[in-house]
C-alpha cells in the first residue's frame, strides 16, 4: 500500500453533507495576531 502526502490543487468535495464547501475560498482578511 502507498501513503500519499498529496499535492496542492483545486478540488471537489464528494460528500454533500460534510459541512465544508467544495473548494473553500480564501478568507479576504487576516485576524489580528
Amino acid at each position: 500500500s502507498e501513503t500519499t502526502t498529496g499535492t496542492s490543487s483545486n478540488s471537489s468535495q464528494s460528500t454533500s453533507n460534510s459541512g465544508l464547501a467544495p473548494n473553500p475560498t480564501n478568507a479576504t482578511t487576516k485576524a489580528a495576531g
Epitope: 500519499t4 502526502t5 498529496g6 499535492t7 496542492s8 490543487s9 483545486n10 478540488s11 471537489s12 468535495q13 464528494s14 460528500t15 453533507n17 460534510s18 459541512g19 465544508l20 464547501a21 467544495p22 473553500p24 475560498t25 480564501n26 478568507a27 479576504t28 482578511t29
Partner: antibody, heavy 115, light 112 residues
C-alpha cells in the same frame, strides 16, 4: 456506525517530533476528505490540516501556523490518515481530533509539548 | 481569517425553557453555489465534539427537532425550544465556506 480512532499522543520536548495516526471504520474512507483539528484552553478549537481525495490529486491544505512543520498523509488501503509533526512548539499542545469534515469526529489524542 | 463570534459565553437555563445562541461571522458565509456552510457542534463534558446542524439549518440524523438553526450571510442562531439535561455542554459554530475553517469561541450551556 462510523468510528475514527486516533493514536500516537504523548509528551515531547520543544523542537521534537510526533506522528498521529487515525484509522476509520464504518464508512467508505476513500470518499471522504480527512482533517485534523486541535483543541486547547488557549486557542479553543482550531482546524489544522486537510487531505482530499485521489480524484482531487490528494490536495492538501494547512493552517498557516503549521505550514512547513506538519505533514498530512493518507493511505486509503488502510483507511488511515496521518499527521507528522516536526519542530514542535509549546503552542502545539492540545487534543488532536481526526475528522471527516464537520460530521464525524474521533475521540481525540493528547499532545503535550514541554521541557 | 474569518472571525466567528459567539454570544453569550455562558447560558444558564432551566430544564424545559428555551435557549438561544448567536454566531456572527466577519465575512459572509454564502458560497458561490448558493449554499451557506455554517455548522453547529455540541461538545459534552469529557467527549469529542458532535455535529448537530449543517448548512445553517439541516439537522443531523438522531438530533432532536427541538434544535433549530437559522440565519444567513453573517448572522446565525441556534435555538433549543425546550432544554433537556442531555443538552448541557459547549456549543460551537464552525464555518466551512472560507479557508482556513474557523470556529466560534463556544457557548457553555449550564442547567439551572
Amino acid at each position: 456506525e462510523v468510528n475514527l480512532e486516533e493514536s500516537g499522543g504523548g509528551l515531547v520536548q520543544p523542537g521534537g517530533s510526533m506522528e498521529f495516526s487515525c484509522v476509520a471504520s464504518g464508512l467508505t474512507f476513500s470518499d471522504h476528505w480527512m482533517n485534523w483539528v486541535r483543541q486547547s484552553p488557549e486557542k479553543g478549537l482550531e482546524w489544522v490540516a486537510q487531505i482530499q481525495l485521489k480524484s482531487d490529486n490528494y490536495a492538501i491544505r494547512y493552517v498557516e501556523s503549521v505550514k512547513g512543520r506538519f505533514s498530512i498523509s493518507r493511505d486509503d488501503s488502510k483507511s488511515s490518515v496521518y499527521l507528522q509533526m516536526n519542530n514542535l512548539r509549546a503552542e502545539d499542545s492540545g487534543i488532536y481530533y481526526c475528522t471527516t469534515g464537520t460530521d464525524y469526529w474521533g475521540q481525540g489524542t493528547t499532545l503535550t509539548v514541554s521541557s | 481569517d474569518v472571525v466567528m463570534t459567539q454570544t453569550p459565553l455562558t447560558l444558564s437555563v432551566t430544564i424545559g425553557q428555551p435557549a438561544s445562541i448567536s454566531c456572527k461571522s466577519s465575512q459572509s458565509l454564502l458560497y458561490s453555489n448558493g449554499k451557506t456552510y455554517l455548522n453547529w457542534l455540541l461538545q459534552r463534558p469529557g467527549q469529542s465534539p458532535k455535529r448537530l446542524i449543517y448548512l445553517v439549518s439541516k439537522l443531523d440524523s438522531g438530533v432532536p427537532d427541538r434544535f433549530t438553526g437559522s440565519g444567513s450571510g453573517t448572522d446565525f442562531t441556534l435555538k433549543i425550544s425546550r432544554v433537556e439535561a442531555e443538552d448541557l455542554g459547549v456549543y460551537y459554530c464552525i464555518q466551512g465556506t472560507h479557508f482556513p475553517y474557523t470556529f466560534g469561541g463556544g457557548t457553555k450551556l449550564e442547567i439551572k
